[in-house]
Interface confidence: medium
Protein backbone atom coordinates (compact mmCIF):
# COMPACT_ATOMS: atom_id res chain seq x y z
CA UNK A 1 0.00 0.00 0.00
CA UNK A 2 1.62 3.07 -1.16
CA UNK A 3 0.46 7.09 -1.73
CA UNK A 4 0.60 7.82 -5.10
CA UNK A 5 -0.76 11.95 -5.07
CA UNK A 6 0.54 13.43 -1.53
CA UNK A 7 -1.57 14.97 0.64
CA UNK A 8 -3.01 18.18 0.24
CA UNK A 9 -4.78 20.22 2.98
CA UNK A 10 -6.64 23.92 3.14
CA UNK A 11 -7.90 25.27 6.10
CA UNK A 12 -11.17 27.64 6.64
CA UNK A 13 -9.02 28.97 9.44
CA UNK A 14 -11.88 28.71 12.39
CA UNK A 15 -11.78 25.03 12.97
CA UNK A 16 -11.26 22.55 10.20
CA UNK A 17 -8.70 21.74 7.79
CA UNK A 18 -9.38 19.22 5.05
CA UNK A 19 -6.74 17.00 3.57
CA UNK A 20 -7.25 14.63 0.61
CA UNK A 21 -4.38 12.28 -1.10
CA UNK A 22 -4.84 9.22 -3.40
CA UNK A 23 -3.47 5.83 -2.75
CA UNK A 24 -2.04 3.63 -5.97
CA UNK A 25 -5.38 1.13 -5.52
CA UNK A 26 -8.59 0.63 -4.29
CA UNK A 27 -8.63 1.38 -0.63
CA UNK A 28 -10.95 1.41 2.58
CA UNK A 29 -9.37 4.84 3.89
CA UNK A 30 -11.08 4.27 7.27
CA UNK A 31 -10.24 1.10 8.60
CA UNK A 32 -6.47 0.57 6.39
CA UNK A 33 -5.61 4.18 7.06
CA UNK A 34 -4.59 7.07 9.80
CA UNK A 35 -3.68 10.62 9.26
CA UNK A 36 -1.88 11.99 12.83
CA UNK A 37 -1.89 15.46 12.91
CA UNK A 38 0.31 17.15 15.73
CA UNK A 39 0.54 21.50 16.55
CA UNK A 40 4.16 21.83 16.87
CA UNK A 41 4.23 23.36 19.86
CA UNK A 42 5.84 22.40 23.30
CA UNK A 43 2.85 20.25 25.04
CA UNK A 44 0.68 19.85 22.08
CA UNK A 45 -1.10 16.92 21.76
CA UNK A 46 -1.30 14.41 18.60
CA UNK A 47 -5.19 14.12 17.11
CA UNK A 48 -6.05 10.76 14.85
CA UNK A 49 -8.23 11.92 11.81
CA UNK A 50 -10.16 8.86 10.04
CA UNK A 51 -10.19 9.55 6.76
CA UNK A 52 -13.43 9.11 4.55
CA UNK A 53 -13.28 7.49 0.72
CA UNK A 54 -13.68 10.12 -2.01
CA UNK A 55 -13.29 7.66 -5.05
CA UNK A 56 -11.83 3.94 -5.18
CA UNK A 57 -8.05 5.28 -4.38
CA UNK A 58 -8.95 8.77 -2.73
CA UNK A 59 -9.28 9.94 0.76
CA UNK A 60 -9.95 12.40 2.64
CA UNK A 61 -9.65 13.76 6.68
CA UNK A 62 -11.35 16.48 8.17
CA UNK A 63 -8.56 18.13 10.44
CA UNK A 64 -10.61 19.65 13.75
CA UNK A 65 -8.59 22.16 15.11
CA UNK A 66 -8.63 24.72 18.08
CA UNK A 67 -8.58 28.76 16.76
CA UNK A 68 -5.91 28.90 14.17
CA UNK A 69 -3.55 31.61 14.17
CA UNK A 70 -1.27 32.84 11.40
CA UNK A 71 1.57 30.93 13.30
CA UNK A 72 0.65 27.85 13.57
CA UNK A 73 1.99 24.99 12.10
CA UNK A 74 0.77 21.10 11.89
CA UNK A 75 3.03 17.92 11.30
CA UNK A 76 0.96 14.94 9.63
CA UNK A 77 1.45 11.28 9.63
CA UNK A 78 -0.29 8.95 7.36
CA UNK A 79 -0.45 5.50 8.42
CA UNK A 80 -1.12 2.60 7.26
CA UNK A 81 -1.23 0.08 10.76
CA UNK A 82 2.83 0.07 11.80
CA UNK A 83 3.45 1.56 8.64
CA UNK A 84 4.79 5.15 7.91
CA UNK A 85 3.40 5.88 4.19
CA UNK A 86 4.04 9.45 4.08
CA UNK A 87 5.06 12.66 6.29
CA UNK A 88 4.67 15.99 5.91
CA UNK A 89 3.72 19.21 7.38
CA UNK A 90 0.81 21.98 7.00
CA UNK A 91 0.89 26.07 7.88
CA UNK A 92 -2.98 26.61 7.90
CA UNK A 93 -2.83 30.28 7.24
CA UNK A 94 -0.96 29.78 4.17
CA UNK A 95 -3.37 27.11 2.57
CA UNK A 96 -6.46 29.13 3.31
CA UNK A 97 -9.74 28.21 1.84
CA UNK A 98 -12.60 30.49 3.49
CA UNK A 99 -16.24 28.94 4.47
CA UNK A 100 -18.77 29.63 1.74
CA UNK A 101 -21.48 32.55 2.79
CA UNK A 102 -24.60 31.38 3.79
CA UNK A 103 -28.49 32.07 4.20
CA UNK A 104 -28.30 34.04 0.27
CA UNK A 105 -31.57 36.22 0.11
CA UNK A 106 -32.90 37.88 -2.66
CA UNK A 107 -35.19 40.93 -1.98
CA UNK A 108 -37.58 41.98 -4.85
CA UNK A 109 -39.86 44.62 -3.08
CA UNK A 110 -37.46 47.27 -2.83
CA UNK A 111 -38.92 49.29 -5.85
CA UNK A 112 -36.94 48.21 -8.99
CA UNK A 113 -34.16 47.31 -7.56
CA UNK A 114 -32.97 43.79 -6.56
CA UNK A 115 -31.03 43.37 -3.26
CA UNK A 116 -28.86 40.38 -2.24
CA UNK A 117 -28.16 39.91 1.28
CA UNK A 118 -26.35 37.16 2.32
CA UNK A 119 -24.24 36.10 5.77
CA UNK A 120 -20.37 36.27 6.42
CA UNK A 121 -19.53 32.83 7.28
CA UNK A 122 -16.92 33.87 10.13
CA UNK A 123 -17.81 34.70 13.62
CA UNK A 124 -17.04 38.79 14.48
CA UNK A 125 -13.76 37.66 16.57
CA UNK A 126 -12.17 35.62 13.47
CA UNK A 127 -9.66 37.60 11.55
CA UNK A 128 -11.33 36.57 8.13
CA UNK A 129 -14.51 38.25 9.51
CA UNK A 130 -13.28 41.40 8.54
CA UNK A 131 -11.62 40.87 5.20
CA UNK A 132 -13.36 38.64 3.30
CA UNK A 133 -14.71 40.11 -0.28
CA UNK A 134 -17.26 38.59 -2.47
CA UNK A 135 -18.58 36.93 -5.76
CA UNK A 136 -21.95 37.20 -6.93
CA UNK A 137 -23.03 34.56 -9.93
CA UNK A 138 -26.17 35.51 -11.02
CA UNK A 139 -27.64 33.37 -14.25
CA UNK A 140 -30.90 33.10 -16.04
CA UNK A 141 -32.71 29.47 -16.09
CA UNK A 142 -33.72 29.59 -19.62
CA UNK A 143 -30.88 31.02 -21.58
CA UNK A 144 -27.26 29.50 -20.66
CA UNK A 145 -25.39 32.62 -22.19
CA UNK A 146 -27.20 34.99 -19.34
CA UNK A 147 -24.77 34.58 -17.17
CA UNK A 148 -22.96 37.25 -14.90
CA UNK A 149 -20.35 37.87 -12.22
CA UNK A 150 -20.49 40.71 -9.90
CA UNK A 151 -17.56 41.43 -7.38
CA UNK A 152 -18.47 42.88 -4.26
CA UNK A 153 -15.34 44.59 -2.97
CA UNK A 154 -16.58 45.92 -0.09
CA UNK A 155 -17.23 44.48 3.59
CA UNK A 156 -20.47 44.53 3.93
CA UNK A 157 -22.44 41.46 2.64
CA UNK A 158 -24.91 42.76 0.19
CA UNK A 159 -25.10 44.02 -3.26
CA UNK A 160 -28.11 46.04 -5.02
CA UNK A 161 -28.59 45.71 -8.64
CA UNK A 162 -31.34 47.37 -10.46
CA UNK A 163 -34.00 44.99 -11.53
CA UNK A 164 -33.66 46.37 -15.11
CA UNK A 165 -30.14 45.19 -15.64
CA UNK A 166 -31.78 41.66 -15.65
CA UNK A 167 -34.53 40.09 -18.29
CA UNK A 168 -38.00 40.68 -16.91
CA UNK A 169 -40.82 37.85 -16.65
CA UNK A 170 -38.37 35.32 -16.29
CA UNK A 171 -36.57 33.36 -13.32
CA UNK A 172 -33.11 33.98 -12.17
CA UNK A 173 -30.83 32.15 -9.69
CA UNK A 174 -28.16 33.72 -7.90
CA UNK A 175 -24.79 32.22 -5.70
CA UNK A 176 -22.06 33.91 -3.96
CA UNK A 177 -18.56 32.79 -2.67
CA UNK A 178 -15.64 34.67 -0.59
CA UNK A 179 -12.22 35.16 -0.66
CA UNK A 180 -9.84 37.11 1.41
CA UNK A 181 -7.14 38.79 0.04
CA UNK A 182 -4.94 39.30 2.85
CA UNK A 183 -4.29 35.20 2.97
CA UNK A 184 -4.08 34.79 -0.84
CA UNK A 185 -6.66 32.38 -0.19
CA UNK A 186 -8.08 29.72 -2.29
CA UNK A 187 -12.44 30.82 -3.06
CA UNK A 188 -14.80 29.04 -0.87
CA UNK A 189 -16.87 26.57 -2.55
CA UNK A 190 -20.21 28.84 -3.55
CA UNK A 191 -23.24 29.23 -1.41
CA UNK A 192 -26.55 27.33 -2.39
CA UNK A 193 -28.56 29.06 -4.94
CA UNK A 194 -31.52 31.07 -4.51
CA UNK A 195 -34.49 31.16 -7.14
CA UNK A 196 -36.55 34.08 -8.02
CA UNK A 197 -38.96 35.87 -10.66
CA UNK A 198 -37.88 39.01 -12.07
CA UNK A 199 -40.28 41.30 -13.13
CA UNK A 200 -40.34 44.74 -13.16
CA UNK A 201 -42.09 47.74 -14.43
CA UNK A 202 -40.98 48.69 -17.73
CA UNK A 203 -40.49 52.35 -18.70
CA UNK A 204 -43.19 54.22 -20.31
CA UNK A 205 -41.80 54.96 -23.72
CA UNK A 206 -43.01 58.34 -25.67
CA UNK A 207 -43.01 58.16 -29.38
CA UNK B 1 20.75 -10.19 0.86
CA UNK B 2 20.01 -6.75 -0.65
CA UNK B 3 22.62 -5.01 -3.21
CA UNK B 4 22.59 -1.75 -4.37
CA UNK B 5 25.86 -1.36 -6.68
CA UNK B 6 26.60 2.08 -8.18
CA UNK B 7 28.33 2.67 -11.64
CA UNK B 8 29.30 6.01 -13.31
CA UNK B 9 31.58 7.29 -11.91
CA UNK B 10 35.09 9.08 -13.67
CA UNK B 11 36.94 11.59 -14.29
CA UNK B 12 34.96 14.60 -15.99
CA UNK B 13 36.05 18.13 -16.65
CA UNK B 14 34.04 20.82 -14.92
CA UNK B 15 30.86 22.16 -16.76
CA UNK B 16 30.39 18.66 -18.05
CA UNK B 17 28.26 16.16 -17.32
CA UNK B 18 28.12 12.55 -15.72
CA UNK B 19 24.89 9.78 -15.24
CA UNK B 20 25.14 7.68 -12.36
CA UNK B 21 23.33 4.30 -11.87
CA UNK B 22 22.89 2.38 -9.18
CA UNK B 23 21.36 -1.33 -9.79
CA UNK B 24 19.16 -2.63 -6.74
CA UNK B 25 18.16 -6.20 -6.02
CA UNK B 26 17.30 -8.13 -3.37
CA UNK B 27 14.17 -6.02 -2.08
CA UNK B 28 10.61 -4.98 -4.17
CA UNK B 29 12.47 -1.79 -5.20
CA UNK B 30 9.35 0.08 -5.93
CA UNK B 31 7.96 -0.16 -2.53
CA UNK B 32 10.77 2.21 -1.44
CA UNK B 33 12.11 5.75 -1.91
CA UNK B 34 15.90 6.24 -2.39
CA UNK B 35 18.56 8.75 -1.91
CA UNK B 36 22.13 10.05 -3.06
CA UNK B 37 24.61 11.01 -0.47
CA UNK B 38 28.06 12.36 -1.20
CA UNK B 39 31.09 12.69 0.87
CA UNK B 40 33.79 14.59 -0.36
CA UNK B 41 37.78 13.66 0.21
CA UNK B 42 38.38 13.43 3.43
CA UNK B 43 35.24 15.26 4.34
CA UNK B 44 31.50 14.33 5.90
CA UNK B 45 28.33 12.80 4.39
CA UNK B 46 25.90 14.83 2.60
CA UNK B 47 22.56 13.75 1.35
CA UNK B 48 22.24 15.00 -2.63
CA UNK B 49 18.45 14.54 -3.20
CA UNK B 50 15.65 11.72 -2.71
CA UNK B 51 13.30 10.24 -4.79
CA UNK B 52 9.83 8.26 -3.75
CA UNK B 53 8.49 4.96 -5.28
CA UNK B 54 6.12 6.62 -8.01
CA UNK B 55 9.56 8.96 -9.45
CA UNK B 56 8.21 11.93 -7.72
CA UNK B 57 11.49 14.00 -6.69
CA UNK B 58 11.68 14.43 -2.73
CA UNK B 59 14.25 17.53 -3.54
CA UNK B 60 17.89 18.58 -3.71
CA UNK B 61 20.75 19.84 -1.49
CA UNK B 62 21.19 23.58 -2.64
CA UNK B 63 24.42 22.77 -3.63
CA UNK B 64 23.10 20.75 -6.61
CA UNK B 65 20.02 22.08 -7.08
CA UNK B 66 19.08 22.99 -11.02
CA UNK B 67 21.70 21.08 -11.92
CA UNK B 68 21.29 17.35 -10.79
CA UNK B 69 18.41 15.19 -11.15
CA UNK B 70 17.52 12.10 -9.70
CA UNK B 71 15.47 9.83 -11.79
CA UNK B 72 14.43 5.91 -11.30
CA UNK B 73 13.10 3.01 -13.52
CA UNK B 74 11.14 0.22 -11.24
CA UNK B 75 11.24 -2.01 -14.12
CA UNK B 76 14.56 -2.06 -14.53
CA UNK B 77 15.27 -1.80 -10.49
CA UNK B 78 17.58 1.04 -11.12
CA UNK B 79 18.21 4.50 -9.36
CA UNK B 80 19.86 7.44 -11.06
CA UNK B 81 21.34 10.46 -11.26
CA UNK B 82 22.06 12.97 -14.05
CA UNK B 83 24.86 15.61 -13.03
CA UNK B 84 25.24 18.75 -15.29
CA UNK B 85 27.61 21.70 -15.04
CA UNK B 86 29.78 19.57 -12.73
CA UNK B 87 31.79 21.87 -10.73
CA UNK B 88 35.20 20.47 -8.53
CA UNK B 89 33.54 21.01 -5.32
CA UNK B 90 30.82 17.64 -6.84
CA UNK B 91 33.82 15.50 -6.51
CA UNK B 92 33.13 13.13 -4.31
CA UNK B 93 32.36 9.49 -3.57
CA UNK B 94 28.64 8.83 -4.34
CA UNK B 95 26.49 6.39 -2.59
CA UNK B 96 23.08 4.99 -3.71
CA UNK B 97 21.17 4.35 -0.40
CA UNK B 98 17.42 2.81 0.20
CA UNK B 99 14.71 4.14 2.46
CA UNK B 100 12.79 2.22 4.37
CA UNK B 101 9.12 3.55 3.36
CA UNK B 102 8.03 4.64 -0.05
CA UNK B 103 7.59 8.06 0.22
CA UNK B 104 8.58 8.99 3.90
CA UNK B 105 9.57 6.86 6.62
CA UNK B 106 9.88 6.71 10.60
CA UNK B 107 13.29 4.88 10.08
CA UNK B 108 15.25 6.31 7.48
CA UNK B 109 17.36 4.98 5.39
CA UNK B 110 18.61 1.69 6.30
CA UNK B 111 21.21 0.34 3.14
CA UNK B 112 24.01 1.85 1.54
CA UNK B 113 25.69 0.40 -1.55
CA UNK B 114 29.64 0.58 -1.88
CA UNK B 115 29.61 4.37 -3.59
CA UNK B 116 31.08 5.19 -7.06
CA UNK B 117 33.72 8.04 -7.36
CA UNK B 118 33.19 10.98 -9.14
CA UNK B 119 35.99 13.28 -9.82
CA UNK B 120 35.64 16.74 -11.43
CA UNK B 121 38.97 18.33 -12.50
CA UNK B 122 40.77 20.02 -15.72
CA UNK C 1 16.59 24.08 6.13
CA UNK C 2 17.41 21.85 9.49
CA UNK C 3 20.83 22.28 10.51
CA UNK C 4 22.77 19.31 12.28
CA UNK C 5 25.22 20.45 15.02
CA UNK C 6 27.37 17.57 16.35
CA UNK C 7 29.69 17.12 19.12
CA UNK C 8 32.33 16.93 19.76
CA UNK C 9 34.29 16.90 16.51
CA UNK C 10 37.05 14.86 17.39
CA UNK C 11 37.36 12.09 20.18
CA UNK C 12 39.98 10.27 22.09
CA UNK C 13 39.07 7.65 24.53
CA UNK C 14 40.21 4.38 25.80
CA UNK C 15 38.80 0.60 25.69
CA UNK C 16 36.52 0.34 28.14
CA UNK C 17 35.53 4.27 27.87
CA UNK C 18 31.98 4.95 28.10
CA UNK C 19 31.26 7.79 25.35
CA UNK C 20 28.72 10.05 24.61
CA UNK C 21 28.18 12.31 20.82
CA UNK C 22 26.11 14.77 20.69
CA UNK C 23 23.66 15.64 17.92
CA UNK C 24 21.48 19.26 18.19
CA UNK C 25 18.72 19.80 15.41
CA UNK C 26 18.14 24.24 15.01
CA UNK C 27 14.40 23.37 14.86
CA UNK C 28 12.34 20.28 16.21
CA UNK C 29 12.17 17.00 14.31
CA UNK C 30 10.35 14.97 17.12
CA UNK C 31 12.47 11.39 16.80
CA UNK C 32 13.25 11.33 13.25
CA UNK C 33 17.33 10.76 13.64
CA UNK C 34 19.66 7.86 12.43
CA UNK C 35 22.95 6.90 14.01
CA UNK C 36 25.65 5.69 11.71
CA UNK C 37 29.15 4.51 11.68
CA UNK C 38 32.21 4.78 8.91
CA UNK C 39 34.96 2.74 9.10
CA UNK C 40 37.90 3.99 6.65
CA UNK C 41 37.14 2.82 3.07
CA UNK C 42 33.96 1.61 3.91
CA UNK C 43 29.97 2.50 3.55
CA UNK C 44 28.22 3.88 6.23
CA UNK C 45 26.79 1.26 8.89
CA UNK C 46 23.42 1.94 10.57
CA UNK C 47 23.43 1.73 14.55
CA UNK C 48 20.19 3.48 15.75
CA UNK C 49 17.22 4.38 14.00
CA UNK C 50 14.26 6.58 15.46
CA UNK C 51 16.43 8.21 18.08
CA UNK C 52 16.46 5.15 20.44
CA UNK C 53 15.79 1.92 18.18
CA UNK C 54 19.43 0.00 18.05
CA UNK C 55 19.67 -1.67 14.20
CA UNK C 56 19.71 -5.43 14.34
CA UNK C 57 22.61 -7.10 14.49
CA UNK C 58 24.36 -3.85 16.51
CA UNK C 59 25.95 -4.69 19.76
CA UNK C 60 23.76 -3.92 22.90
CA UNK C 61 27.02 -1.05 24.17
CA UNK C 62 25.61 1.04 21.92
CA UNK C 63 22.12 3.32 22.50
CA UNK C 64 20.48 6.49 21.66
CA UNK C 65 18.27 8.84 23.25
CA UNK C 66 16.80 12.05 23.05
CA UNK C 67 13.66 13.26 21.01
CA UNK C 68 12.82 17.04 19.51
CA UNK C 69 15.90 18.91 19.34
CA UNK C 70 18.57 16.74 21.17
CA UNK C 71 20.11 13.92 21.02
CA UNK C 72 22.81 11.56 22.09
CA UNK C 73 24.57 8.24 20.80
CA UNK C 74 26.42 6.44 23.48
CA UNK C 75 29.02 3.56 23.88
CA UNK C 76 28.37 2.09 27.34
CA UNK C 77 32.01 0.00 27.02
CA UNK C 78 34.42 1.02 24.11
CA UNK C 79 35.58 -1.88 22.11
CA UNK C 80 38.71 -2.14 19.96
CA UNK C 81 36.01 -2.35 16.66
CA UNK C 82 33.85 0.68 17.98
CA UNK C 83 37.07 3.62 17.18
CA UNK C 84 35.40 4.82 13.72
CA UNK C 85 33.65 8.10 12.51
CA UNK C 86 30.20 8.91 13.24
CA UNK C 87 27.38 10.51 12.31
CA UNK C 88 23.93 11.66 12.86
CA UNK C 89 21.36 12.61 10.47
CA UNK C 90 17.99 13.78 10.86
CA UNK C 91 14.50 12.70 8.23
CA UNK C 92 11.98 14.58 9.64
CA UNK C 93 11.85 17.15 6.54
CA UNK C 94 13.81 17.35 2.96
CA UNK C 95 16.72 18.08 2.80
CA UNK C 96 17.90 15.52 4.62
CA UNK C 97 21.12 16.77 6.86
CA UNK C 98 24.15 14.92 8.43
CA UNK C 99 25.73 16.47 11.64
CA UNK C 100 29.50 17.26 10.95
CA UNK C 101 30.60 13.96 11.91
CA UNK C 102 32.52 12.73 15.55
CA UNK C 103 36.14 11.29 14.62
CA UNK C 104 36.62 8.60 17.53
CA UNK C 105 40.12 7.85 18.43
CA UNK C 106 42.10 5.24 20.88
CA UNK C 107 43.87 7.40 23.18
Known amino acids: MKVLQEPTCVSDYMSISTCEWKMNGPTNCSTELRLLYQLVFLLSEAHTCIPENNGGAGCVCHLLMDDVVSADNYTLDLWAGQQLLWKGSFKPSEHVKPRAPGNLTVHTNVSDTLLLTWSNPYPPDNYLYNHLTYAVNIWSENDPADFRIYNVTYLEPSLRIAASTLKSGISYRARVRAWAQCYNTTWSEWSPSTKWHNSYREPFEQH | EIQLVESGGGLVQPGRSLRLSCAAS????????MHWVRQAPGKGLEWVSGINWNNGSLGYADSVKGRFTISRDNAKNSLYLQMNSLRTEDTALYYC???????????????WGHGTTVTVSS | DIQMTQSPSSLSASIGDRVTITCRASQGIRNDLGWYQQKPGKAPKRLIY???SLQSGVPSRFSGSGSGTEFTLTISSLQPEDFATYYCLQHNSYPYTFGQGTKLEIK
Open chain 2, 26 to 33: GFTFDDYA
Open chain 2, 97 to 111: VKDTGSWASYYGMDV
Open chain 3, 50 to 52: AAS
